[in-house]
Amino acid sequence: QDSPPQILVHPQDQLFQGPGPARMSCQASGQPPPTIRWLLNGQPLSMVPPDPHHLLPDGTLLLLQPPARGHAHDGQALSTDLGVYTCEASNRLGTAVSRGARLSVAVLREDFQIQPRDMVAVVGEQFTLECGPPWGHPEPTVSWWKDGKPLALQPGRHTVSGGSLLMARAEKSDEGTYMCVATNSAGHRESRAARVSIQEPQDYTEPVELLAVRIQLENVTLLNPDPAEGPKPRPAVWLSWKVSGPAAPAQSYTALFRTQTAPGGQGAPWAEELLAGWQSAELGGLHWGQDYEFKVRPSSGRARGPDSNVLLLRLPEKV
């Protein structure tokens, strides 16, 4: 019994990977058996040389080489996009049209968004090498190489996240030249080589007297904005504190500050800023309209003394 065409197998999105050919499938039912016709971006394909398309008896479209890209269609602007193919199955009772299948070509651009930088890390501490790969279709994967060989990632010690390499605990053996490699089906690109030097931690004996230091944070005062900083300067405060205990054991003082969250809420992490003073100092880089907590911590080399009391200050919306 005669029946109109129905598409049974729709063409699928494809990535053209040289040297080709690419195949687009289309199968249809119907009585009499329907004839298959292919369209590219809505235009029928001629199938006559030098057209690179070829129709097989079962309705499959063979693409021997990527078609020349005409004008960008349907808002497309990337050289990766070769067009949308649809097939039509027709008999005397009607025509069925398949879903559109996009044909694209693999591309890997040359410019890295972020190149890894030379750096110095300390034994036992963590460090990160950043890498932002070039744009690619399909999206490239990132791997890391050290001294010309693929880096063997050790679980718990190495993490690759968003292209960047995180080293949990630096070891002397981590010293060397690192390179980030972006790879997809179009090929691969290498970043610049970044030199990583690993230093031993500074030897120190923790000054026992530092533990006996007592810091009293006495005052936190909002400073008047400097007119030279333009129309919207960031607020700064003046911290003043008193030190009691052994005679001046601290080599430096650090301000710890954070925005206050709602009562019972998870506290924000403390930000740290080295202070340029031994009893008072300015602290900048704050934000208007926030409630802040401040405290001061003494330190000598890598040793840290106990934190001071905490003082609160509400910064107005803007001065």
Epitope: L78, E110, P138, G163
Partner: antibody, heavy 118, light 112 residues
Framework: EVQLVESGGGLVKPGGSLKLSCAAS????????MSWVRQTPEKRLEWVAT????????YYPDSVKGRFTISRDNAENTLYLQMSSLRSEDTAMYFC???????????WGHGTTLTVSS | DAVMTQTPLSLPVSLGDQASISCRSS???????????LNWYFQKPGQSPQLLIY???NRFSGVLDRFSGSGSGTDFTLKISRVEAEDFGVYFC?????????FGGGTKLEIK
Amino acid sequence: EVQLVESGGGLVKPGGSLKLSCAASGFTFSTYAMSWVRQTPEKRLEWVATISNGGTYTYYPDSVKGRFTISRDNAENTLYLQMSSLRSEDTAMYFCARLIYYDYLDYWGHGTTLTVSS
Amino acid sequence: DAVMTQTPLSLPVSLGDQASISCRSSQSLENSNGNTYLNWYFQKPGQSPQLLIYRVSNRFSGVLDRFSGSGSGTDFTLKISRVEAEDFGVYFCLQVTHVPWTFGGGTKLEIK
């Protein structure tokens, strides 16, 4: 025709959170990197975030790093910007924009307004 | 960060005149592959920015040839050969060579 439509803006208190969305149509969303750009009340433009076509790679300026997260749903043709620990200086009109490779932003949405104030 | 400085802040011109806007970067925008990613945008009040010029000197589709971009390294220029009524608004430069991407402060082209 390329269309980008932002939504989700509003008034938020300092320290609060908000999620912006951008619905894309008229192009194959999954092959394009996307960005968020904001325009301050003083009309300065500031780049806020960029995400790669597949969503694996994200980039931010220091001013929003750790507070804002850009993401995308390629099946739904939607771009997102999750913002937390909002500050008064985040007050701006937020635009989503399409990227050609990582070379230039060619099409921009009409924007959605965020106001951070107590 | 690459700080982008646009001059002048405001540019009063008469219809038919030539206008020239400068954009200077605090560091070279040419990357290690010799590519320079400096783009120019135009914005009218209440509208979103529109791309005019990409990669220093390439006109975006539909942009008239009255607009031209030039420059290299740290110094870039946008020229409008014969200013027409629809050209009045604000022009921005944007560099995407270095992360973070940075915009110039804008130049307002206004009627003299």
